[in-house]
Amino acid sequence: EGSEREENVEKEGLCNACAWRQNTRYSRIEAIKIQILSKLRLETAPNISKDAIRQLLPRAPPLRELIDQYDVQRDDSSDGSLEDDDYHATTETIITMPTESDFLMQADGKPKCCFFKFSSKIQYNKVVKAQLWIYLRPVKTPTTVFVQILRLIKPMKDGTRYTGIRSLKLDMSPGTGIWQSIDVKTVLQNWLKQPESNLGIEIKALDENGHDLAVTFPGPGEDGLNPFLEVKVTDTPKRSRR
Amino acid sequence: EGSEREENVEKEGLCNACAWRQNTRYSRIEAIKIQILSKLRLETAPNISKDAIRQLLPRAPPLRELIDQYDVQRDDSSDGSLEDDDYHATTETIITMPTESDFLMQADGKPKCCFFKFSSKIQYNKVVKAQLWIYLRPVKTPTTVFVQILRLIKPMKDGTRYTGIRSLKLDMSPGTGIWQSIDVKTVLQNWLKQPESNLGIEIKALDENGHDLAVTFPGPGEDGLNPFLEVKVTDTPKRSRR
Amino acid sequence: DFGLDCDEHSTESRCCRYPLTVDFEAFGWDWIIAPKRYKANYCSGECEFVFLQKYPHTHLVHQANPRGSAGPCCTPTKMSPINMLYFNGKEQIIYGKIPAMVVDRCGCS
Amino acid sequence: DFGLDCDEHSTESRCCRYPLTVDFEAFGWDWIIAPKRYKANYCSGECEFVFLQKYPHTHLVHQANPRGSAGPCCTPTKMSPINMLYFNGKEQIIYGKIPAMVVDRCGCS
């Protein structure tokens, strides 16, 4: 009877150790999850599905660049520097997708592109680079494309509602479409200084026949081809002082 | 009887807490001392007296500069960055005092100045700045001083034993002596690349009457006026890899 | 410099670093675009001597202890950040650095 | 961000940062030219909840524990270096930075 009890105790010990290992693994990962949300200043994990991500994720060079910029598996984590910043995450690049705006409506009530909403956390003097990326649909014959980025303004006396940000002329050959980026750093900095001046932009990319090649509202098979803003910031974390 | 026991227990508790506080304070400080030695890669605390320090400590601008460079009291420690290097100390400045050398002997067998011994840890490509500091004794009348730094070399066929490193001419006014610094970065880098070429240097600072004003072996009241080398290095600590 | 590395089969009782992979896909965090998983690691084990400590600032003599601290314990002594690309739930994708996400070394503190 | 500050008269039982001054002159370390003293601080106190932790990489559930780790403990979560000017015993005066010499914040880990 004694040896049986001993055996049971031993089994229980092994079971306990096993359960402990499972539990601690689970609790560690739960703790890390809570930690990540806290470090990213998120109250809960964003509720976004795989499909929604596939639709939203820009299929553009900057996104591939960010994904390729570091070894996703992080096999050699030991090479990282000793913890050299504070608790919260520091932001280096912000990719902003357009949202709808009351100002940007067509005559038929459909929304026009593009309004970009910015967090008040981005300081204008911390902006290193700001690029507007637009996707131009493929052309069937070689053509010259006139790209025009306009900024929506409060109506002037003469009825003017837009002012030019940037214009460029480029040659396109038949084949796949292309991504084009436009420097909008100054505009963005002005928007951040005076948020009320950010009423939206209009994107036009007209070929020689007047067809607009810019993808502003993606059609079928055009997921991830929305315009977007790529903003690089220097984020020097503030030293917390007691 | 019960209340007396309780009182004793309480007293004992207070004593224990007191002893504990003293003990932990002592043990913490002991642990920190061990830590510091380990971080500085020292096996024991250097055995050097207050008097020896007074004699050795150069009374020169770079030393005052280093002592003034940070608040010695470090009242606002919380402003430091999060721990961003590895375990060991990183070296920024090395002040090297001359040592005796077999090569540098006068005819009467007395040592001549100056031989500087270097640690093999200093890498030549990490040297940012190297200055030889020499103290020139005060003069009684305005005079021009010719400073000459010579490098000892293996005797050549014609008997030459020295080659010039740097010469300079400066005007001195009566009053206190002055510290003069000479750039020796290139020489030091060569010594580090080829340690066998470091046989020593000779310092001469002759006034118009041929008197040598350079303090090479301090006389009475000249403690801390030895020549010395101030070397600034960039010390990127190697990442330890498992 | 010091700090032991162990695995789950190790019989080491002293303070040691063990592997732990956090797999975001496994628990449905699709909003994290990259990395999909990373090696976080963790610290576990016993701390016996003050001299094994990296940071002696927690050392407590095992005597009457009015504050109930349990003496030096096994904890990260070197950590590193990871870069992360993620949706923040506000039509934005953020690329940034998250501090102290990987345990590189464990010690007694 | 978080991390409590206490002093020797504090009745706080939770994990807290306490002052501790290291005085080199007091124990005859004249070879350290500067600083003559510095505030090192230390961590002490109890750790109750996993969510108070800064680094969850040490968290252990309080169950049968094959490795005898004592769960999260109060330890430095932010440290800073000090600059030091010292004789190294080889006719040299060194000015350098010594990492992790000051406890800036304590947390449960």
């Epitope: 299929r59 660049e65 084949g175 292309i178 991504w179 084009q180 | - | 990395p35 999909k36 | -």
Partner: antibody, heavy 119, light 110 residues
């Protein structure tokens, strides 16, 4: 007309350094990633490396120690430099627009240039 | 290292038949869909057929289609044409600057 064209030596001696140039027209290198892919005679395609629109480089693990890819946007050129060439590096080297496997990368290729490594 | 395995090595079919080519990756491609298919004929550079695992590239006939996700992918040619005789390669992207090609499947027309 959008084109990519590889140029460089057809013969390289073992241990020597190979330098190949990819000259593009109708492509803005500041907006476009360029990849290098090689193919040994009678064998399959092998990814070599990328230079991104932003100038960052990514190399195949086997090539990391020997490979450098750079670009001169003003000259519309991307340059591949591979040191310490070996007969096993004999292959046709292609440059391609974009990154094969990412979006529609690899939609446009140069004709390729055959490099033989032999003494 | 990542290994991409294509099967079969050779596929010999008659015109009008359905061809099914398989590509298996030793680890999941990034976002489960960083995978492209290329066609290569002797003496020519590769030609992009499918990207994002299932999106038909510009100007590619609709008889070509792609499917699959994660580690297992398929290229289907619904009705083989004589001009489809070529070698077909899959290419995968894994994030962290890592990309790889399969060893290829040769399609012969009887």
């Amino acid at each position: 007309q959008v084109t990519l064209k590889e140029s460089g030596p057809v013969l390289v001696k073992p241990t020597e350094t190979l330098t190949l140039t990819c000259t593009v027209s109708g492509i803005d290198l500041s907006h476009t990633d360029i990849s290098w892919v090689r193919q040994a005679p009678g064998k399959g395609l092998e990814w070599v490396g990328i230079i991104s629109y932003a100038g960052k480089t990514y190399y195949a693990s086997w090539a990391k120690k020997r490979l450098t890819i750079s670009k001169d946007t003003s000259k519309n050129q991307v340059v591949l430099t591979m040191t310490n060439m070996d007969p096993v590096d004999t292959a046709t080297y292609y440059c391609a627009r974009g990154v094969p496997a990412y979006s529609h990368g690899g939609d446009l290729w140069g004709q390729g240039t055959l490099v033989t490594v032999s003494s | 290292d990542i290994v991409m395995t294509q099967s079969p090595a050779t596929l010999s079919l008659s015109p009008g038949e359905r061809a099914t080519l398989s590509c298996t990756s030793s680890q999941s491609v990034y976002h489960a869909n960083w995978l492209s298919w290329f066609q290569q004929k002797p003496g020519q550079p590769p030609k992009l057929l499918i990207y994002w695992a299932s999106t038909l590239a510009y100007g590619v006939p609709s008889r070509f289609s792609g499917s699959g996700s994660g580690t297992d992918f398929t290229l289907t040619i619904s009705s083989l044409q004589p001009e489809d005789a070529a070698t077909y390669y899959c290419a995968g992207g894994y994030g962290g600057g890592r990309y790889a090609f399969g060893q290829g499947t040769k399609v012969e027309i009887k």
